[in-house]
């Protein structure tokens, strides 16, 4: 039975040209995390494998940095970066836990963080 929950940074906004940290945290489970995938539109941005560590997809090496922790930092943001991002925790024996973050990249300086929320 999957007992864990993922807490994420929820709906967030940031300024064009700036950077943002995407964060997820898995709690309430003793399952072993084998790999965390960060994805946007079904495309892998980065993976963090328990044995091999962090890897940034070759397509995103210039603008994506690992961490902090199991989070992901997006740099040099453009309006095209607006959209859904997913942290996918592959665990044993529970299976897969998915967290969703919606990022809005704004032209002006009115960017502010949304509330945190949980996905069961």
């Amino acid at each position: 039975m999957m007992t864990g929950t993922i807490e994420t940074t929820g709906n967030i906004s940031a300024e064009k040209g700036g950077s943002i940290i995407l964060q997820c945290h898995l709690s309430s489970t003793t399952a072993q995390v084998t790999q965390v995938n960060w994805e946007q539109q079904d495309q892998l941005l980065a993976i963090c494998n328990a044995d091999l560590g962090w890897h940034i997809s070759p397509s995103f090496k210039d603008r994506v940095a690992p961490g902090p922790g199991l989070g992901l930092t997006l740099q040099s943001l453009t309006v095209n970066d607006t959209g859904e991002y997913f942290c996918i925790y592959h665990t044993y024996p529970d299976g897969t836990y998915t967290g969703r973050i919606f990022l809005e990249v704004l032209e002006s300086s009115v960017a502010e963080h949304g509330a945190r929320f949980q996905i069961p």
């Epitope: 084998t34 995938n37 495309q43 892998l44 993976i47 494998n49 044995d51 091999l52 890897h55 070759p58």
Partner: antibody, heavy 122, light 107 residues
Framework: QVQLVQSGAEVKKPGASVKVSCKAS????????IHWVRQAPGQGLEWMGI????????SYAQMFQGRVTLTRDTSTNTVYMELSSLRSEDTAVFYC???????????????WGQGTLVTVSS | DIQMTQSPSSLSASVGDRVTITCRAS??????LNWYQQKPGKAPELLIY???NLQNGVPSRFSGSGSGTDFTLTISSLQPEDFATYYC?????????FGQGTKVEIR
């Protein structure tokens, strides 16, 4: 051109260990992961493990955990696969394979060694 | 681990036939699916990566499609050198797992 050249066939007794080498050439050795794949006679392909030639970090398939060890020698651009506690079911061809994408461990295997037949028999 | 299931396990076809092999993943692997060809006594060769991208040097009669859990390898017009065993492989998470193979034989 890219080449992965493996060591020759081996015959081993049950309980023994075998060490197979895979010498890489034609590309930057430390930039691409190397995988090992086992194929028993008439059977399919079975992933065994992976090594990062740059830092030496490894990951192994659960069924080989504790029995397989991957190492590398950056001075000779060679990766080694050692399998211990051999049993007759380990009789197989062992392949090394290079990952397609630089510093990305899951890009597909674009170059393969010629294979090394390991026969385990008493 | 992600299970990969190929069908059929074998098929008989003639030169010039259109051949389709399917591969199903036990969970969503997006488009992280590769296809390999293996001839007897030889190492496998990468045909297609990321579901539909043809590896350099691979003839255009080979094509791949699909996303999520269901994928297809198509040979538009089977040639004598295409009689071989074909494997799918997911490259979404480690360990990268293979299908059991599909043997394409001469009818």
């Amino acid at each position: 051109q890219v080449q992965l050249v493996q060591s020759g066939a081996e015959v081993k007794k049950p309980g023994a260990s075998v060490k197979v080498s895979c010498k890489a050439s034609g590309y930057t050795f430390t930039s691409y992961y190397i995988h090992w794949v086992r194929q028993a006679p008439g059977q399919g392909l079975e992933w065994m493990g992976i090594i990062n030639p740059s830092g030496g970090r490894t990951s192994y398939a659960q069924m080989f955990q504790g029995r397989v060890t991957l190492t590398r020698d950056t001075s000779t651009n060679t990766v080694y696969m050692e399998l211990s506690s051999l049993r007759s079911e380990d009789t197989a061809v062992f392949y090394c394979a290079k990952d397609r994408e630089e510093q990305w461990p899951v890009g597909g295997f674009d170059y393969w060694g010629q294979g090394t037949l390991v026969t385990v028999s008493s | 681990d992600i299970q990969m299931t190929q069908s059929p396990s074998s098929l008989s076809a003639s030169v010039g036939d259109r051949v389709t092999i399917t591969c199903r993943a036990s969970q969503n692997i997006r488009r992280y699916l590769n296809w390999y060809q293996q001839k007897p006594g030889k190492a496998p060769e990468l045909l297609i990566y990321s579901a539909s991208n043809l590896q350099n040097g691979v003839p255009s009669r080979f094509s791949g499609s699909g996303s999520g859990t269901d994928f297809t390898l198509t040979i538009s017009s089977l040639q004598p050198e295409d009689f071989a065993t074909y494997y799918c492989q997911q490259s979404y998470i480690i360990p990268p797992t293979f299908g059991q193979g599909t043997k394409v034989e001469i009818r």
